[in-house]
């Protein structure tokens, strides 16, 4: 039985040209996290595997950085980065948990999000 829940940063916004941290946290389960996949719509951004470490998709290497932790840092944001992001936790023995984050990249300085997830 899958008892875990995914907590995410929810809906966030950031300024064009800036950076943002995408964070998910799996709680309420003792399942072992074997791998976390980060996807943007239908694109694989990155994978963090318990044995192999991080793999960043080559087409995103210049703008995506691993971490902190199992999170993902997006840099040099453009308006095209606006959209849904998914953290997919592969666990044993529970199975797969998925979290959703919506990022809006804004042209001006009206972007607001929790300071805890912002890169100075």
């Amino acid at each position: 039985m899958m008892t875990g829940t995914i907590e995410t940063t929810g809906n966030i916004s950031a300024e064009k040209g800036g950076s943002i941290i995408l964070q998910c946290h799996l709680s309420s389960t003792t399942a072992q996290v074997t791998q976390v996949n980060w996807e943007q719509q239908d694109q694989l951004l990155a994978i963090c595997n318990a044995d192999l470490g991080w793999h960043i998709s080559p087409s995103f290497k210049d703008r995506v950085a691993p971490g902190p932790g199992l999170g993902l840092t997006l840099q040099s944001l453009t308006v095209n980065d606006t959209g849904e992001y998914f953290c997919i936790y592969h666990t044993y023995p529970d199975g797969t948990y998925t979290g959703r984050i919506f990022l809006e990249v804004l042209e001006s300085s009206v972007a607001e999000h929790g300071a805890r997830f912002q890169i100075p």
């Epitope: 996807e39 694109q43 694989l44 994978i47 044995d51 998709s57 087409s59 044993y92």
Partner: antibody, heavy 118, light 107 residues
């Protein structure tokens, strides 16, 4: 250099058994999921079975479920496929394969031919 | 099971031609699509993984695109060593499934 070397293939009668082995070298075997893929003569590729790094997750194709057993010995850097109740349609070249991040096969062995015939 | 349909099943082309092979999944597989090249008597070789990522050591004339259900492998300028059979494979869910293959022959 990553190397995967299969052995154990050969001619066997229908209903018989074989055990394939795949000796791995050149990488940290215990960190990778491993798969078996087969190819019947003149045909395409067919996935057979997979096992994750610590053998906690194992999967089989429906066509071999209940007859084949995948296993691994991380201390010996070796992958196995025990094949029982073999049928003529199991005749194929069997490849062992390394699968990083559980998603793509980046290295294949040279293959070992299994022929099931009376 | 997810079915993978490749087209064409074979094609004839000349050195220098641009070649496109398509692969369609029976349901959305996000970007979990890989492409392999196989020559007679040899094991397959990984060309493209995760739909568009070029495997290390593979020439840049090979490229992959697509997401969801429709994917494409393109060889921008066919070379003599590229005459082979190409397979797509989904890794979205087990059982992992391959396309039927596309044989690229010399015209």
């Amino acid at each position: 250099e990553v190397q995967l070397l299969e052995s154990g293939g050969g001619l066997v009668q229908p209903g018989g058994s074989l055990r394939l082995s795949c000796a791995a070298s050149g990488f940290t075997f215990s960190s990778y999921s491993m798969h078996w893929v087969r190819q019947a003569p003149g045909k395409g590729l067919e996935w057979v079975s997979s096992i994750n790094s610590n053998a906690g997750t194992i999967s089989y194709a429906d066509s071999v479920k209940g007859r084949f057993t995948i296993s691994r010995d991380n201390s010996k850097n070796t992958l196995y496929l025990q094949m029982n109740s073999l049928r003529a349609e199991d005749t194929a070249v069997y490849y062992c394969a390394r699968v990083p991040y559980d998603y793509w096969i980046d290295y294949w062995g040279q293959g070992t031919l299994v022929t099931v015939s009376s | 099971d997810i079915q993978m349909t490749q087209s064409p099943s074979s094609l004839s082309a000349s050195v220098g031609d641009r070649v496109t092979i398509t692969c369609r999944a029976s349901q959305s597989i996000s970007s979990y699509l890989n492409w392999y090249q196989q020559k007679p008597g040899k094991a397959p070789k990984l060309l493209i993984y995760a739909a568009s990522s070029l495997q290390s050591g593979v020439p840049s004339r090979f490229s992959g695109s697509g997401s969801g259900t429709d994917f494409t492998l393109t060889i921008s300028s066919l070379q003599p060593e590229d005459f082979a059979t190409y397979y797509c494979q989904q890794s979205y869910s087990t059982p992992l499934t391959f396309g039927g293959g596309t044989k690229v022959e010399i015209k």
